[in-house]
């Protein structure tokens, strides 16, 4: 079982929409798959998917979950507010038949505000 | 391009532990995502698939020949191993070790094949 | 285990003729998850390692002459040669990857008739 998740960047304007992708792929079938999102270490949501849906629609705060066959889990937050920034790690496990576990690489999402001034003291603030 | 080859002794005598060794070259072993595989073909016959080990190194073997097979990565030398014990004429077979990928979960890369014989 | 039956064991097709080889599976090789099947074809020709033709019961591997395609879903699959060339004699196998242990059908030999 191996998780890719993207992008490992993501700059968006408050009010806007976030995807983050997750791509979940193992070389033999599936029947059911527990996938997790969590934020800054938190859990969102931990839904399963089995024949071909998720259990779980939602995951946390104005966030959306889909699947697209084969592998494209999907996480859709909108309209996003500050709250929104952090650290979102994508984490699947494969239950039947046998388990495996996996996860992404750290997506990191800035929020910018509305305010101009507030998003030009924001970016001074971060190194690099 | 990723290319297999397979190396070890052509015979092995009945009830002694075949030993065959697979070099990669052109990518590396550790790379996420990858089942690194044995398969034998009995002389004129179809291809069993013997088992394989994850870059993760969890192995994973034939039911059938479970009890007497040891796969192993040697990740400094860019190889990975096959153990086969207490072997009979049965064993005789050629030996191909091949790739697989999470993405797939076909054989895309073959290594050429190495003919072991188990005879006293 | 899953087991792989080919039909027929051999087959002998005239050059430029159709050649059709077929595999059937005891039990579906379809995920509702994936929307795929996991069944692979493969070429060997003497002396050589099996070369993979067609991944998902219908994808061409890359460089793989398009006169090779497979088709079928489920349990019952099919590869064909649209129009046979002397390079083509080989024997030709299918595999399933559902789920382990990993099967192979039993072959099917193609010759020119």
């Known amino acids: 079982l191996s998780v890719q998740q993207g992008p490992n960047l993501l700059q968006v304007r408050q009010g806007s929409q976030a995807t983050l992708v997750c791509q979940v792929d193992q070389a033999t079938a599936w029947e059911r798959l527990r996938v997790k999102w969590t934020k800054d270490g938190a859990i969102l949501c931990q839904p399963y998917i089995t024949n071909g849906s998720l259990s779980l629609g939602v995951c946390g705060p104005q966030g959306r979950l889909s699947w697209q066959a084969p592998s494209h889990l999907t996480l859709q937050l909108d309209p996003v507010s500050l709250n929104h920034s952090g650290a979102y790690v994508c984490w699947a496990a494969v239950e039947i038949p046998e388990l495996e576990e996996a996860e992404g690489n750290i997506t990191r999402l800035f929020v910018d505000p509305d305010d101009p001034t507030q998003n030009r003291n924001r970016i001074a603030s971060f190194p690099g | 391009q990723v290319q297999l080859q397979e190396s070890g002794p052509g015979l092995v005598k009945p009830s002694q532990t075949l030993s065959l060794t697979c070099t990669v070259s052109g990518f590396s072993i550790t790379t996420g995502g990858y089942y690194w595989s044995w398969i034998r073909q009995h002389p004129g016959k179809g291809l069993e698939w013997i088992g394989y080990?994850?870059?993760?190194?969890?192995?994973y073997y034939n039911p059938s020949l479970k009890s007497r097979v040891t796969i192993s990565v040697d990740t400094s030398k860019n190889q990975f191993s096959l153990k086969l014990s207490s072997v009979t004429a049965a064993d005789t077979a050629v030996y191909y070790c091949?790739?697989?990928?999470?993405?797939?979960?076909?054989?895309?890369?073959w290594g050429q094949g190495t003919l072991v014989t188990v005879s006293s | 285990d899953i087991v792989m039956t080919q039909s027929p064991d051999s087959l002998a097709v005239s050059l430029g003729e159709r050649a059709t080889i077929n595999c059937k599976s005891s039990?579906?090789?379809?995920?509702?998850?994936?929307?795929?099947?996991?069944l692979a074809w493969y070429q060997q020709k003497p002396g050589q390692p099996p070369k993979l033709l067609i991944y998902?019961?219908?994808t061409r591997e890359s460089g793989v002459p398009d006169r090779f395609s497979g088709s079928g879903s489920g349990t019952d699959f099919t590869l064909t040669i649209s129009s046979l060339q002397a390079e083509d004699v080989a024997v030709y196998y299918c595999?399933?990857?559902?789920?382990?242990?990993?099967?192979f059908g039993q072959g099917t030999r193609l010759e020119i008739k």
């Open positions: 039990q579906s090789l379809f995920s509702s998850n994936t929307k795929r099947n996991y």
């Open positions: 595999q399933q990857h559902y789920e382990t242990p990993l099967t």
């Open positions: 998902h019961a219908s």
């Open positions: 080990i994850y870059t993760s190194g969890r192995t």
């Open positions: 091949a790739d697989m990928a999470d993405k797939g979960g076909w054989f895309a890369y």
